[in-house]
Amino acid sequence: ESGYAQNGDLEDAELDDYSFSCYSQLEVNGSQHSLTCAFEDPDVNITNLEFEICGALVEVKCLNFRKLQEIYFIETKKFLLIGKSNICVKVGEKSLTCKKIDLTTIVKPEAPFDLSVVYREGANDFVVTFNTSHLQKKYVKVLMHDVAYRQEKDENKWTHVNLSSTKLTLLQRKLQPAAMYEIKVRSIPDHYFKGFWSEWSPSYYFRTPEINNSSGEMDPI
């Protein structure tokens, strides 16, 4: 671990901020798990920097990350999924900074998909449905979903609804008539596993019906 003292680049490197963050994705590719890490500071010179994870692995001491542009990435079946691993930023054999992380507490689910909205004329409501790959998984099965919707003209006025199922009913009377709405959904682990919100699903756009003047109800699209 010595032998670098005369290396001016390394001495400079030790003054830098190598703080980093990571997230895990379980069964992201069949039975393979992934771990992704990146530096908090986008200006860090990553030329000679490597990431390594040691501990809480199956029948190996350590694994090295692959570098993909600005991120570092591992895909493996060898996570024990219990206890803390030691994740280190390294230059050669020297560790610059390390963090002990339990991979089950930094899980980022895959984004939901197939989001759609169907208007039910008789019920005067909108049925929102979406899908998640996590229904088929062995580990991160229980998720909390965050459905966010807004009137397209209201840039930052999102309304959020949390739910554990993949179906939501929006009452017509709670929405503006004859308006275009944008809706999207994301997920977070909600049982045993902990972590971060997934990326947002692709947005879905729908229009609310006009108000029928005689009855005060909206016309269907």
Epitope: C54, L81, N86, Y139
Partner: antibody
Framework: QVQLVQSGAEVKKPGASVKVSCKAS????????MNWVRQAPGQGLEWMGL????????SYNQKFKGRVTLTRDTSISTAYMELSRLRSDDTAVYYC????????????WGQGTTVTVSS | EIVLTQSPATLSLSPGERATLSCSAS?????MHWYQQKPGQAPRPLIY???KLASGIPARFSGSGSGTDFTLTISSLEPEDFAVYYC????????FGGGTKVEIK
């Protein structure tokens, strides 16, 4: 209090198999690894393998791979170690030990199970 | 696989004396643990992660070291400290040293 209670002593013939149990109490069984360590008479300690009780994932010492099988029954908070194709040099005390997942040391040990292999 | 060599194999000391036990690794180890074992008993943890005292362990026990060289020190031996001591690496395959027996002189 946290406790690991192992099954009783066994006498086996060469070529046979032995299955040792380890019942955990006083903590959440699925929250810690269960490790197995053996000690031959007058010798040091040798780690054999571990199991993650939450998902059944195992990690074995290469020396024992193929001969040792670790399993668990979460409904009764019990871990099992089965060693097959027994030889006389498998005569030892077999310990189960809870693994502390923050620091990876064995913080709680069973009382040990003596396995004697003799023809 | 890392080999842990403990020295001396036997340490003969009197109660009240200071005991210094060494554990040398064949390659660099991030963390080291220490256990005590008495005849007919299971091992019990003494020191984890190089220098942290396990639950219920008296302060006369201390650990130090880094890289390939680690030390367990007992500042003043009590009668109940005469036992065998093992070092162990924190990572797969969780190798133990051969042990140091601390006996009464």
């Amino acid at each position: 209090q946290v406790q690991l209670v192992q099954s009783g002593a066994e006498v086996k013939k060469p070529g046979a198999s032995v299955k040792v149990s380890c019942k955990a109490s006083g903590y959440t069984f699925t929250g810690y690894t269960m490790n197995w360590v053996r000690q031959a008479p007058g010798q040091g300690l040798e780690w054999m393998g571990l199991i993650n009780p939450y998902n059944g994932v195992t990690s074995y010492n290469q020396k024992f791979k193929g001969r040792v099988t670790l399993t668990r029954d979460t409904s009764i908070s019990t871990a099992y170690m089965e060693l097959s194709r027994l030889r006389s040099d498998d005569t030892a005390v077999y310990y189960c030990a809870r693994g502390d997942g923050d620091y990876w040391y064995f913080d709680v040990w069973g009382q040990g199970t003596t396995v004697t292999v003799s023809s | 696989e890392i080999v842990l060599t403990q020295s001396p194999a036997t340490l003969s000391l009197s109660p009240g004396e200071r005991a210094t036990l060494s554990c040398s690794a064949s390659s660099s180890v991030t963390y080291m643990h220490w256990y005590q074992q008495k005849p007919g008993q299971a091992p019990r943890p003494l020191i984890y992660e190089i220098s942290k005292l396990a639950s219920g362990i008296p302060a006369r026990f201390s650990g130090s070291g880094s890289g390939t060289d680690f030390t367990l020190t007992i500042s003043s031996l009590e009668p109940e400290d005469f036992a065998v001591y093992y070092c162990q690496e924190w990572n797969y395959p969780y190798t133990f040293g051969g042990g140091t027996k601390v006996e009464i002189k």
